[in-house]
Amino acid sequence: QGWQAFKNDATEIIPELGEYPEPPPELENNKTMNRAENGGRPPHHPFETKDVSEYSCRELHFTRYVTDGPCRSAKPVTELVCSGQCGPARLLPNAIGRGKWWRPSGPDFRCIPDRYRAQRVQLLCPGGEAPRARKVRLVASCKCKRLTRFHNQSELKDFGTEAARPQKGRKPRPRARSAKANQAELENAY
């Protein structure tokens, strides 16, 4: 019933049906910061721990503009990329290129997205067209996930679920064009 998965000629790589295309990785004005995150207490022995929270994961920060067709976001967004091998927090180097990666000979721990957030961005379009907005889904944090030989790549999707929250109160809207005025960018995590 749905379309088949398909990679198109445009600037997006198309995921499977039912997922949204992520914005293309156009890293204009790219600022990259790197930090080790999600560390816990050091394990007694690197191969004996069963607590994933004891492993640390690398989060790279990228700043880019969101584009859609001929439009570009008024401001850049900052997103995380989960990177690298997971190892005990105390053994991970603090920066890329320093120290050695800790590579476990035991179970495979992968650094994958833990939580996502949606950010609303105002798009600036040529020709003075109507104001438009887009919501982009960005990684909010990364985690170490233990992968056994029974896991497959679909584990890496592992999208977080959000706790139900009551809706914010609605403000009365006398005019229809609040998208123009509403430049607020929303960063609620889930």
């Epitope: 609303r120 809207r173 929303l186």
Partner: antibody, heavy 118, light 107 residues
């Protein structure tokens, strides 16, 4: 898998109101824009408006301004469209749709038939 | 409101045919045009946006072109599942408007 499931058909009298629901699954409703589009029997598509469930921001087509209200319950990932002061020309299939933008309709519900008849 | 005029309103074609549907805007809409496919009793499906960008998983036989006021949806080789009604939509200026539709029928 993104799915939008709408409430069942309604028959209303002129002057009454109708409230159509749209249950979204596959992602949190507040992370997208919710749209409503209608289609009169044998006719084309007509955009009614969009809402941003995250902050309750709405944009209505001028034709429906003052008669339509779009709301959401983010705890149940359900969108609602209420149309008041119904007239016979409001007889149509009402579709909810969702999208990551305010201007295109990425995924659609199955439609809800609303019949306005005295 | 910007008017979107589609032509033809209906056409008959055979499997394997190349089909072209046109949409004319009453004023310049740049490339802010989307195309949808609708089958009887079903909801529409997004095919093309920004005049020429295919939506998720849409087969490559569907292509869109145009800018300004004249837009085209082309199906390079019509398949049995392509018999449906096609609508263009502009999103250059509020409120968003659709064309009247083009019904593609089996010859």
């Amino acid at each position: 898998q993104v799915q939008l499931v709408q409430s069942g058909a309604e028959v209303k009298k002129p002057g009454a109101s109708v409230k159509v629901s749209c249950k979204v699954s596959g992602f949190p409703i507040k992370h997208h824009f919710q749209h409503w589009v209608r289609q009169a029997p044998g006719k084309g598509l007509e955009w009614m408006g969009w809402s941003d469930p995250e902050i309750g921001d709405t944009e209505y087509a001028s034709k429906f301004q003052g008669r339509v209200t779009m709301t959401e319950d983010t705890s149940t990932d359900t969108a609602y469209m209420e149309l008041s002061s119904l007239r016979s020309e409001d007889t149509a299939v009402y579709y909810c749709a969702t999208g990551d933008t305010t201007y295109k309709f990425d995924f659609w519900g199955q439609g809800t038939t609303v019949t306005v008849s005295s | 409101d910007i008017q979107m005029t589609q032509s033809p309103s209906s056409l008959s074609a055979s499997v394997g045919d190349r089909v072209t549907i046109t949409c004319k805007a009453s004023q310049d809409v740049h490339t802010a045009v989307a195309w949808y496919q609708q089958k009887p009793g079903k909801a529409p499906k997004l095919l093309i946006y920004w005049a020429s960008t295919r939506w998720t998983g849409v087969p490559s036989r569907f292509s869109g072109s145009g800018s300004g006021t004249d837009f085209t949806l082309t199906i390079s080789s019509l398949q049995p599942e392509d018999f449906a009604t096609y609508y263009c939509q502009q999103y250059s200026d509020y409120h968003w408007t659709f064309g009247g539709g083009t019904k593609v029928e089996i010859k």
